[in-house]
């Protein structure tokens, strides 16, 4: 539908509160360094303008596109050149190039201070004093640190954030009530951000077809009773929603997501029996619930796939005349039968099937050529199964922290050029696959583990893309979206790496480590472990374990000492010397 004024259309559809929140998110995701007050001012100006367009759609500038309106507004920021450098050059461009330019300057790792959580009483006072500003600040701080956060979902997080403060600031023990809720929101928020970052990377780096294939597989697992045509419609709509959000079109994205939720709930009988509860919820909760809904039961007596995809005389004709439809149907049929497979595995199987048909269909006897295509799937299925089995055994044996350490060593040896903070962050997240997925029964392990690993490895890819240092990382990240994990798994020790020069400063610790939380202390130790491996890539597990055990004992000893700083200084020197000797440095 063409509207005379797009801004008026979206304002009316979304309502003032959501409109303002989404514009704030959009601006904060583009101009990540701008102060909160500046963004609020810009949002208010846009909102006032939108209201004039609602009153009269023919008013001046109301016919302009949202990109033009928002881009013009962002380009009024006085400090653009000194704060953002070359991003200011975007303002010399015309739409749509200007928006593309802004998108290219989004920073996945902005140089922003860590968010420190104030005391509960301080937070509750701020919440009561000015609830609106408090919640806007939440949106702003999350959006600028996560420039690809799924905007309509961030509205849902903000709603839960508000609910937590509304409830807990009245509670007898505010901290006991609030802190677990904030921890949960933080962890869920990080996970949500990372999942959305993979969707955007999929769309931006591998194109719409890659995203659609992912969506066909996932929705077919989730809605196995739905017809292919229904799944295809949902995939088309979902692709539009995510394309918009990843492209910075947050108002359109939120509006279209609401429409999609409405459609799903109006047609739940032909989609899934699991949607009933979701569809009784208010909009934001409803959309979130649908996105997370459990897989429906598979229809009984599904016929063998071989009939349509191997035995039929029309296989090659169907493939050649409409690959998207035929391979889409293959993926749909395979995925709905296999909720026990990861989406990336299903996509690998579909690619193998496609490659086989492309090779065989022009042959003298196509059927003879592709008759055994399903046999080619066996090793592809067994590889992640075996990998997950081995790693879950290792996780159960070591526990999360030591499992993370094993992965830290493994990945530092594979790609030692990658920065230490990135290796620590990524390996810690890879290690969380254990507690997240190994508790599941066999049938749920692979979709949990491998699809989670895809999300984490995408973090490595986007961080590495900002400052590329390893050809091996670039290769694994860019060659194939679905083969990223097998590509990284297959990497051996990088024999070309020249060990890092030893720097005692890297291994000098102070009494401040004693006041850190357990998590922060782990990160310090894991940082030291990565640095050790970078100095001595050929160190054995046993050597590294001995040094790390000594290090843990050293920290524990000095944190109990009366004069902690002296202990760290003196014992630290001894530890460095002993470690050098143990590792032959």
């Amino acid at each position: 539908d063409a509207h005379k004024s797009e801004v008026a259309h979206r304002f009316k559809d979304l309502g003032e509160e959501n409109f303002k929140a989404l514009v704030l998110i959009a601006f904060a995701q583009y101009l990540q360094q701008c102060p909160f007050e500046d963004h609020v001012k810009l949002v208010n100006e846009v909102t006032e303008f939108a209201k004039t367009c609602v009153a009269d759609e023919s008013a001046e500038n109301c016919d302009k596109s949202l990109h033009t309106l928002f881009g013009d507004k962002l380009c009024t920021v006085a400090t653009l050149r000194e704060t953002y450098g070359e991003m200011a050059d975007c303002c010399a461009k015309q739409e749509p190039e200007r928006n593309e330019c802004f998108l290219q300057h989004k920073d996945d790792n902005p140089n922003l201070p860590r968010l420190v959580r104030p005391e509960v009483d301080v937070m509750c006072t701020a919440f009561h004093d000015n609830e609106e500003t408090f919640l806007k600040k939440y949106l702003y701080e999350i959006a600028r640190r996560h420039p690809y956060f799924y905007a309509p979902e961030l509205l849902f997080f903000a709603k839960r954030y508000k609910a937590a403060f509304t409830e807990c600031c009245q509670a007898a023990d505010k901290a006991a009530c609030l802190l677990p809720k904030l921890d949960e929101l933080r962890d869920e928020g990080k996970a949500s951000s990372a999942k959305q970052r993979l969707k955007c990377a999929s769309l931006q780096k591998f194109g719409e077809r890659a995203f659609k294939a992912w969506a066909v597989a996932r929705l077919s697992q989730r809605f196995p009773k739905a017809e292919f045509a229904e799944v295809s419609k949902l995939v088309t709509d979902l692709t539009k929603v995510h394309t918009e959000c990843c492209h910075g079109d947050l108002l359109e994205c939120a509006d279209d997501r609401a429409d999609l939720a409405k459609y799903i709930c109006e047609n739940q009988d032909s989609i899934s029996s699991k949607l009933k509860e979701c569809c009784e919820k208010p909009l934001l909760e409803k959309s979130h619930c649908i996105a997370e809904v459990e897989n429906d039961e598979m229809p009984a007596d599904l016929p063998s796939l071989a009939a349509d995809f191997v035995e039929s005389k029309d296989v090659c004709k169907n493939y050649a005349e409409a690959k998207d439809v035929f391979l889409g149907m293959f993926l749909y049929e395979y995925a709905r039968r296999h909720p026990d497979y990861s989406v990336v595995l299903l996509l690998r199987l579909a690619k193998t099937y496609e490659t086989t048909l492309e090779k065989c269909c022009a042959a003298a006897d196509p059927h003879e050529c592709y008759a055994k295509v399903f046999d080619e799937f066996k090793p592809l299925v067994e590889e992640p199964q075996n990998l997950i089995k081995q790693n879950c055994e290792l996780f159960e044996q070591l526990g999360e922290y030591k499992f993370q350490n094993a992965l830290l060593v493994r990945y530092t040896k594979k790609v030692p050029q990658v920065s230490t903070p990135t290796l620590v962050e990524v390996s810690r997240n890879l290690g969380k696959v254990g507690s997240k997925c190994c508790k599941h029964p066999e049938a749920k392990r692979m979709p949990c583990a491998e699809d989670y690993l895809s999300v984490v490895l995408n973090q490595l890819c986007v961080l590495h893309e900002k400052t590329p240092v390893s050809d091996r990382v670039t290769k694994c990240c860019t060659e194939s979206l679905v083969n990223r994990r097998p590509c990284f798994s297959a990497l051996e020790v990088d024999e070309t790496y020249v060990p890092k020069e030893f720097n005692a400063e890297t291994f000098t610790f102070h009494a401040d480590i004693c006041t850190l939380s357990e998590k922060e202390r782990q990160i310090k130790k894991q940082t030291a472990l990565v640095e050790l491996v970078k100095h001595k890539p050929k160190a054995t597990k046993e050597q590294l374990k001995a040094v790390m055990d000594d290090f843990a004992a050293f920290v524990e000893k000095c944190c109990k000492a009366d004069d902690k700083e002296t202990c760290f200084a003196e014992e630290g020197k001894k530890l460095v010397a002993a470690s050098q000797a143990a590792l032959g440095l």
Epitope: Y319, A320, A322, K323, D324, E358, K359, C361, A362, A363
Partner: antibody, heavy 121, light 110 residues
Amino acid sequence: EVQLLESGGGLVQPGGSLRLSCAVSGIDLSNYAINWVRQAPGKGLEWIGIIWASGTTFYATWAKGRFTISRDNSKNTVYLQMNSLRAEDTAVYYCARTYPGYSTAPYFDLWGQGTLVTVSS
Amino acid sequence: DIQMTQSPSSVSASVGDRVTITCQSSPSVWSNFLSWYQQKPGKAPKLLIYEASKLTSGVPSRFSGSGSGTDFTLTISSLQPEDFATYYCGGGYSSISDTTFGGGTKVEIK
């Protein structure tokens, strides 16, 4: 040495028909897919259609109905039957092999030298 | 409707120059089904590159292809006298019936 050799071109009146041949030597045609591609004087390349080793054919949307591709593996020859010819069908017609290992990709690794078809009254 | 747009339509260059030819497709080609051909006057086309970036055997390494989806590039790193010719991109799509060539780029001597 593998060779593809087109023949059968010439002058034909509008509305007329013509059958082009593509004789293949140096390889067993029965294992390969063959395409027909044309090029109007001073213009670019235009894909007409393909015949797979199995005999299955596909055509460009514009060519469906008027053009028919067939093969005779015993003669190691592929044919292009053209009906209801028009002035705009005037072109050099090439046969070309699809690169082995592909079926629908536009990778044509062996070409004939082409035969000129002129449609004019 | 399938569109395969090649640019520029002609380029004048000297021996040793770096030449870049682009090919834009709408919609995106299927699975990097993108080829590049070289054609000299009165001769049949010759396949240079397939799958967007793979060189066919015997093609000099000064030729390279890149791109994916909708945007592709053929680069000749250092033009040689035998490279003056017309170059075509070819695209394959979801339906084989949509197989299409670009309009061509003539590389001429400056």
